[in-house]
């Protein structure tokens, strides 16, 4: 707390300007009117205040707005935002995307801080859903944002927002998240033609079921191995050698390099060695010729 002291004669601030950088902490407290500061917040950013001086300015705003700052002040916080705690931010009601962008800009290039996470959480909850413009903004600043959400939170993403997602935004998503996002992407891109559809859906395929992979194998998509390796193992296992060959096209020879990685390894173990040999890749580990394969799961379902 800064001690309350009277403002020296002639030092009362009439506007927020560069002269204030020469004020001591107690002078700022005594001579800067909080209401003036609130109306001229946009000037603070252009003035090279010290961290200690910014603490004083924050203190003044906290006194003026004990229930939380209004959006007109929040939008112009600039570097003062870095002084805010998650507790401060929880009092705010941020509804404007412009305000959100202004504050994210301050933190640009850094990891997502607890303050930013709280701000985003408040903003998204206020909107009720993660709309396209918001998602566009958030992923532009934090490519990993989408993958930081739980499957439950992702379920509130409308299919229309999927258009804003770039491949790199999904890099850190796990299979549970892709399980939620894939059906939305399928819906969002359903009216596109074959090759354009594949380009858009490719990043989401880690959530695709077997039947969709089978359908893709009939469309000459030439899936690369990086995408194939991200597919759900349980979705890949039922695919035949012919279907995988069609799905991968010229990339099928890449199976050799990944034969010990999942899902390729598990898929190989399910194929007849004779069928694998037709690929001419030297893949080993298939079911030897003459062996009978019993699908016990099918038997259990029947009994």
């Amino acid at each position: 707390e800064v001690e309350k002291t009277a403002c020296p004669s002639g030092k009362k601030a009439r506007e927020i300007d560069e002269s204030l950088i020469f004020y001591k902490k107690w002078e700022l407290e005594a001579c800067v009117d909080a209401a003036l500061l609130a109306t001229q917040m946009d000037r603070v950013n252009a003035i090279p205040f010290t961290y200690e001086q910014l603490d004083v300015l924050k203190h003044k705003l906290d006194e003026l707005y004990p229930q939380g700052y209004p959006e007109s002040v929040i939008q112009h916080l600039g570097y003062l935002f870095l002084k805010m705690s998650p507790e401060d931010i929880r009092k705010w009601n941020v509804t404007s995307l412009e305000t959100l962008k202004a504050l994210l800009e301050v933190n640009k290039g850094h990891e997502m801080s607890p303050q930013v996470a709280t701000l985003i959480d408040r903003f998204v909850k206020g909107r009720g859903q993660l709309d396209k413009d918001t998602l566009d903004t958030l992923t532009a600043f934090y490519p990993g944002y989408l993958c930081s959400l739980s499957p439950e939170e992702l379920s509130s993403v409308p299919p229309s927002s999927i258009w804003a997602v770039r491949p790199q935004d999904l890099d850190t998503c796990d299979p549970r998240q892709l399980d939620v996002l894939y059906p939305k992407a399928r819906l969002a891109f359903q009216n596109m033609n074959g090759s354009e559809y594949f380009v858009k859906i490719q990043s989401f395929l880690g959530g695709a079921p077997t039947e969709d992979l089978k359908a893709l194998s009939q469309q000459n998509v030439s899936m690369d191995l990086a995408t194939f390796m991200k597919l759900r193992t349980d979705a890949v296992l039922p695919l035949t050698v012919a279907e995988v060959q069609k799905l991968l096209g010229p990339h099928v020879e890449g199976l050799k390099a990944e034969e010990r990685h999942r899902p390729v390894r598990d898929w190989i173990l399910r194929q007849r060695q004779d069928d694998l040999d037709t690929l001419g890749l030297g893949l080993q580990g298939g079911i030897p010729n003459g062996y009978l394969v019993l699908d016990l799961s099918m038997q259990e379902a029947l009994s």
Epitope: D171, D224, L225, A226, M229, A257, E258, E259, H261, G282
Partner: antibody, heavy 119, light 108 residues
């Protein structure tokens, strides 16, 4: 520019562990596996294993099974190779090398990390 | 595991001469799964040739590769001063992946 930057040289005692990092930049991290290859002084190259940064899946050369662990941090575009129960014959330069998923050759290599095991 | 034996261990030649390096595998290697690397003292290896005969990006045309089955060859048609180095063959046809012991090309 595609780069693999490895952590600095290490000196360890027999029985200890060493963890070497390899930070990737200039390309899509999850489109390439990261392999580790070592080279003992005056010797040839020896493949240790690989990791798929997208899935975290690993394959190890059986020679190192139980002693080597490869991990990744996608958010930092970094892979790690930890070798435990070190012995003097583990003294070598350890390289990370990028391998496009679906190929078996290494098109970009790190600068190498010298690990010396000595009592 | 497949053992790759490189010969000769050392090759002493003059700039402008042709260099022929051999790599012999203990069992058959699918030709798509063989590559060559160059390593200079104090440096990391560099990819020269992949799939037996494909030149890697930025590698001059004086380098070429050939072979099939168990016998593979790297040829440098006319040695330049910067070509004096150690060369390794590498296979990923069979697990674990292995490298040859290397051939050192030195100035005569």
């Amino acid at each position: 520019e595609v780069q693999l930057v490895q952590s600095g040289a290490e000196v360890k005692k027999p029985g200890a562990s060493v963890k070497v990092s390899c930070k990737a930049s200039g390309y899509t991290f999850t489109d390439y596996n990261m392999d580790w290859v070592r080279q003992a002084p005056g010797q040839g190259l020896e493949w240790m294993g690989d990791i798929n940064p997208s899935t975290g899946g690993t394959i190890y050369n059986q020679k190192f099974s139980g002693r080597v662990t490869m991990t990744e941090d996608k958010s930092a575009s970094t892979v790690y190779m930890e070798l435990s129960s070190l012995r003097s014959e583990d003294t070598a330069v350890y390289y990370c090398a990028r391998r496009r998923i679906g190929t078996g050759y290494f098109d970009v290599w790190g600068q190498g990390t010298t690990v010396t095991v000595s009592s | 595991e497949i053992v790759l034996t490189q010969s000769p261990a050392t090759l002493s030649l003059s700039p402008g001469e042709r260099a022929t390096l051999s790599c012999s595998a203990s069992s058959s290697v699918i030709s798509s799964y063989l590559s060559w690397y160059q390593q200079k003292p104090g440096s990391s290896p560099r990819l020269l040739i992949y799939r037996t005969s494909n030149l890697a990006s930025g590698i001059p045309a004086r380098f070429s590769g050939s072979g099939s089955g168990t016998d593979y060859t790297l040829t440098i048609s006319s040695l330049e001063p910067e070509d004096f180095a150690v060369y390794y063959c590498h296979q990923w046809s069979s697990f674990p992946y292995t490298f040859g012991g290397g051939t050192k090309v030195e100035i005569k």
